[in-house]
């Protein structure tokens, strides 16, 4: 809207500013338990997971960043049960990685899962 | 507490994992107006900056990934009033990036904020 | 200042294609959603879809799905709306609009007539 | 799809004087965001439609302070303070919190 005001340069600047903000997939780490909905005495080791989720900001306000493809990734975790019965058992988790990602109205009732396996 | 019982290359990778999970600055993308406060008759354009907020995880459930440290950014955007009764202005809009992070046991206060000049 | 201008009036017959444009001025194209409007004759206002022209992502309307496709070609900030299969009640004014980050459609073009007529 | 409901259909209204408009929609038009996407549109004869008011009750570029709209959750209001003769056309709500966008059946503002 402004572009016969202000100089290329700082236009430019302020474009690429908007379009790095733009919704897609971005690395973020999730709790694990608490996306597998596990009881409080189980837990994992690391409790924490990197994965890509959608994220970002999108043409319209009424709009949100969501999910449009997903991949699942496994990763190695120790699970712990409290009282330790046992020695912790390395088990495989599979996590909601987001590959797609689109601008759209409403939210999912269930806009990502992570399978146990 | 396992390194007797796996091999120390699945050890090392979940050691990774959880470095790469620990609280930090991380890239995020924060939607100016609503954290400006502003009225709906007043926006920006881009709506959202990059900026570094804290984020992650802590090894305690009870601690929470916080700001230690912020210095704060200026970013150049347009601020349009509706009705437009002038040319959209081009303002530097200071915008706090978080420089430290660390576990702490409660929420701030005030645990970032934009600065308007 | 923001500017929409759109193609010009078309004739076509029932069964065929048509591809109207709308090259936009003035602002940041990628930057805001485009949508696309139709008015039959004496009629209201009916919604077809949008693109965002940043990705080229499409929401289309459940009624036109599988009719029509919305595209943009970044390099000249210009969208077009495809719709096939045209029936005579696909006669009307097309519409593109610019919508606002706050959802209002804040400018327009002023249309491209689509005649569908054997 | 949300059923946006105007009255009256027709308005004949003298120069100077009130008008209103009311839109009625089949469901609430607040966003999980908290804001309701409800806009109100100007259609003047032989014209493109124009935008006169987003999200309720914000007036947009240009548009003379004799425009307001009011309303909340599925009832809204478009009232003009003084009508002018530059007033005459078709006015139509539409709303965007809901896919698709639909729009009002549209009222008629003509001059007495």
């Known amino acids: 809207f402004a572009a016969t005001f202000y100089d290329i340069e700082t236009l430019k600047v302020i474009d690429e500013e908007w379009q790095r903000t733009q919704c897609s997939p971005r690395e973020t780490c999730v709790e694990v338990a608490s996306e597998l909905g596990k009881s409080t005495n189980t837990f994992f080791k690391p409790p924490c997971v990197n994965v890509f989720r959608c994220g970002g900001c999108c043409n319209e306000e009424s709009l949100i960043c969501m999910n449009t493809s997903t991949s699942y990734i496994s990763k190695q975790l120790f699970e712990i049960s409290v009282p330790l019965t046992s020695v912790p058992e390395l088990v495989p988790v599979k996590v909601a990685n987001h590959t797609g990602c689109k601008c759209l109205p409403t939210a999912p009732r269930h806009p990502y899962s992570i399978i146990r396996r | 507490f396992a390194a007797t019982f796996y091999d120390i290359e699945t050890l090392k990778v979940i050691d990774e994992e959880w470095q790469r999970t620990q609280c930090s600055p991380r890239e995020t993308c924060v939607e100016v107006a609503s954290e400006l406060g502003k009225s709906t008759n007043t926006f920006f354009k881009p709506p959202c900056v990059n900026v570094f907020r804290c984020g992650g995880c802590c090894n305690e459930e009870s601690l929470i990934c916080m700001n230690t440290s912020t210095s704060y950014i200026s970013k150049q955007l347009f601020e349009i009033s509706v009705p437009l009764t002038s040319v959209p202005e081009l303002v530097p809009v200071k915008v706090a990036n978080h420089t430290g992070c660390k576990c702490l046991p409660t929420a701030p206060r005030h645990p970032y904020s934009i600065i308007r000049r | 200042q923001v500017q929409l201008v759109q193609s010009g009036a078309k004739v076509k017959q029932p069964g065929a294609s048509v591809k109207a444009s709308c090259k936009a001025s003035?602002?940041?194209?990628?930057?805001?959603?485009m949508y696309w409007v139709r008015q039959a004759p004496g009629q209201g206002l009916e919604w077809v879809g949008y693109i965002d022209p940043y990705n080229g992502d499409t929401t289309y309307n459940q009624k036109f799905k599988g009719r029509v496709t919305m595209t943009t070609d970044t390099s000249t900030s210009t969208a077009y709306m495809e719709l096939r299969s045209l029936r005579s009640d696909d006669t009307a004014v097309y519409y593109c609009a610019r919508t606002s980050y706050y959802g209002g459609m804040d400018y327009w073009g002023r249309g491209t007539l689509v005649t569908v007529a054997s | 799809d949300i059923v946006m409901t105007q009255t009256p259909l027709s308005s004949p209204v003298t120069l100077g004087q009130p008008a209103s408009i009311s839109c009625r929609s089949s469901?609430?038009?607040?966003?999980?965001?908290?804001?309701?996407?409800l806009h109100w549109l100007q259609q003047r004869p032989g014209q493109p439609p124009r935008l006169l008011i987003y999200?309720?009750?914000n007036r947009f570029s240009g548009v003379p302070d004799r425009f307001s709209g009011s309303g909340a959750g599925t009832d809204f209001t478009l009232k003009i303070s003084r009508v002018e003769a530059e007033d005459v056309g078709v006015y139509y709500c539409?709303?965007?919190?809901?896919?698709?966008?639909?729009f009002g059946q549209g009222t008629k503002l003509e001059i007495k």
């Open positions: 003035g602002y940041t194209f990628t930057g805001y959603n």
């Open positions: 469901q609430s038009l607040v966003h999980s965001n908290g804001n309701t996407y």
């Open positions: 539409s709303q965007s919190t809901h896919v698709p966008r639909t």
């Open positions: 999200k309720v009750s």
